[in-house]
């Protein structure tokens, strides 16, 4: 004799996150009397998704009207699918019974796979700035995607990088996955305007990858070069000495003039000029009253950049000699004075 069969025609269904999944099920008979129930998973831990007889299932709608006479279509729709809904769904016929309905026949199951887009990649750089020629690490993270297959690439100013390591977690089966990648980047003095880009490609993105960026301006520190020069006499007893602070980044910079080791003036870089590469130049000058000195004067331009230890450049001013214009070389080189770098 023919007995009721529960038919789930689809072995698997693939749905994008946020969409509605249709799980098909038909019975071949109206007998025995009793409800159809849908479960996710099998065995004692299975999760009830829908019960024709009773309960409230706000995300579930039936494809056909189950109150209609002769209805044998027990297909359901589950709305607003998330990766957590992935699993195998079983359509199960129960037989009316006392005190409880009795499971009579189960369908073969339909595996619901959820395609979920990866989150926008987040790129983060090192906590502290680094100087050119140093290698720094950038990390890129993206979460919540499914299936597991994903491609991640790194670029610096459009050029693909090769020195990186990528992990997709977890290793085993999961409702959704995360990717974590670390790339190593060698800084150059020209990197103030550079960008590091992490690009993620996934089947859900239909060939339009997601990108996360980090500006190297947040990472790089370009230390300044100093040049101290003596300018032509402005008045009979005055000499103008300038300190050129070149090619530095970021702008945060404090300059101190010392006369024979004593602080003469301290100022903070304000009206800087920007170079094409994004670094800054700044110039400070000091008017020295020669008549106030009996001996030679050692002038030092001391610069503290971005909280780093100070660097300095010195210039010897000979009081006895008639002031004359110095060339572009430092006075220290002309006079044999020591250049002092303080670390």
């Amino acid at each position: 004799e023919e007995e009721l069969q529960v038919i789930q025609p689809d072995k698997s269904v693939l749905v994008a996150a946020g969409e509605t999944a249709t799980l098909r099920c038909t019975a071949t008979s109206l007998i025995p009397v009793g409800p159809i129930q849908w479960f996710r998973g099998a065995g004692p831990g299975r999760e009830l998704i829908y019960n024709q007889k009773e309960g409230h299932f706000p995300r579930v709608t039936t494809v056909s009207d189950l109150t209609k006479r002769n209805n044998m279509d027990f297909s359901i729709r589950i709305g607003n699918i998330t990766p957590a809904d992935a699993g195998t769904y079983y359509c199960v016929k129960f037989r009316k019974g006392s005190p409880d309905d009795v499971e009579f026949k189960s369908g073969a199951g339909t595996e619901l796979s959820v395609r979920a887009k990866p989150s926008a990649p987040v790129v983060s750089g090192p906590a502290a700035r680094a100087t050119p020629q140093h290698t720094v690490s950038f990390t890129c993270e993206s979460h919540g995607f499914s299936p597991r297959d994903i491609t991640l690439k790194w670029f610096k100013n459009g050029n693909e990088l090769s020195d990186f390591q990528t992990n997709v977690d977890p290793v085993g089966e999961s409702v959704s996955y995360s990717i974590h990648s670390t790339a190593k980047v060698v800084l150059t003095r020209e990197d103030v305007h550079s960008q590091v880009i992490c690009e993620v490609a996934h089947v859900t993105l239909q060939g339009d990858p997601l990108r996360g960026t980090a500006n190297l301006s947040e990472t790089i520190r370009v230390p300044p070069t100093l040049e101290v020069t003596q300018q032509p006499v402005r008045a009979e007893n005055q000499v103008n000495v300038t300190c050129q602070v070149r090619k530095f980044y970021p702008q945060r910079l404090q300059l101190t003039w010392l006369e024979n080791g004593n602080v003469s003036r301290t100022e903070t870089a304000s009206t800087v000029t920007e170079n094409k590469d994004g670094t800054y130049n700044w110039m400070s000058w000091l008017l020295v009253n020669v008549s106030a000195h009996r001996d030679d004067v050692k002038l030092t331009c001391q610069v503290e950049h971005d909280g780093q230890p100070a660097v300095s450049k010195s210039h010897d001013l000979k009081v006895s000699a008639h002031p004359k214009e110095q060339g572009s070389n430092t006075a220290a080189e002309n006079t044999g004075s020591n250049e002092r770098n303080i670390y």
Epitope: E1, E2, E3, L4, T28, S29, L30, I31, P32, V33, G34, P35, Q52, K53, E54, L66, T67, R69, N70, N71, M72, R95, K96, G97, S98, P99
Partner: antibody
């Protein structure tokens, strides 16, 4: 659906009633039997589906048996008594979301000595 | 075992009247909605009106309606027509598949 086989029988003489169906498959639908004694109300007897899905009301167990072919369903009154005198109806359906509908016109069984 | 108590056992009404028949189960019916209503005219087979407590059967006029859940159910005829004079039965289903029980019937007669 249409019933047949109703007649006058003496007490204790087994009687088989037949419900002949058309327009639907008996592999998909149960057939329920209901009777109505003269001037009385309706009384549910049982439902005949597949072999394992045949059941009778508690009062009817042992007094009736059921069987079916591809187009007919039989109800056998194993040992009729005068109390079994009634019009016997068969109907497609097995209750709850599959109610009894349509019904046959009925067949009269009279048990008398 | 389920017991279905129908009331009244009979009533007299006029064409156009609103008629209400109640059916009470001794315990909750299966799924709280295993309750059907049937109409029977003399010498005829019963005819399905309502099932699942409130679902109107195909071809049944909309003046018939069913309500209720659990143990208490009502059949309402909103505007009685001459062809509605008949006997009405409720059929309740218990948790056991063989536990289907009719109420004793309500005869609706012309006043």
């Amino acid at each position: 659906v249409e019933e047949s086989g109703g007649r006058l029988v003496t007490p204790g003489t087994p009687l088989t009633l037949t419900c002949t169906v058309s327009g639907f498959s008996l592999s998909s639908h149960g057939i329920s039997w209901v009777r109505q004694a003269p001037g009385k109300g309706l009384e549910y007897i049982g439902t005949i589906g597949t072999g394992v899905i045949t059941y009778f009301a508690s009062w009817a167990k042992g007094r009736f048996t059921g069987s079916k072919t591809s187009t007919t369903v039989d109800l056998k009154i194993t040992s009729p008594t005068t109390e079994d005198t009634a019009t016997y109806f068969c109907a497609r359906g097995s209750a709850w979301n599959d109610p009894f509908d349509p019904w046959g016109p009925g067949t009269l069984v009279t048990v008398s000595s | 075992e389920l017991v279905m108590t129908q009331s009244p056992s009979s009533l007299s009404a006029s064409v156009g009247d609103r008629v209400t028949i109640t059916c009470q189960a001794s315990q909750s019916v299966y799924g709280n909605n295993d309750l059907a209503w049937y109409q029977q005219k003399p010498g005829e087979a019963p005819k399905l009106l309502i099932y699942l407590a409130s679902t109107l059967a195909t071809g049944v006029p909309s003046r018939f309606s069913g309500s209720g859940s659990g143990t208490d159910f009502t059949l309402t005829i909103s505007g009685l027509q001459s062809e509605d004079f008949a006997t009405y039965y409720c059929l309740g289903g218990g948790d056991d598949e063989a536990d289907n029980v009719f109420g004793q019937g309500t005869k609706v007669e012309i006043k």
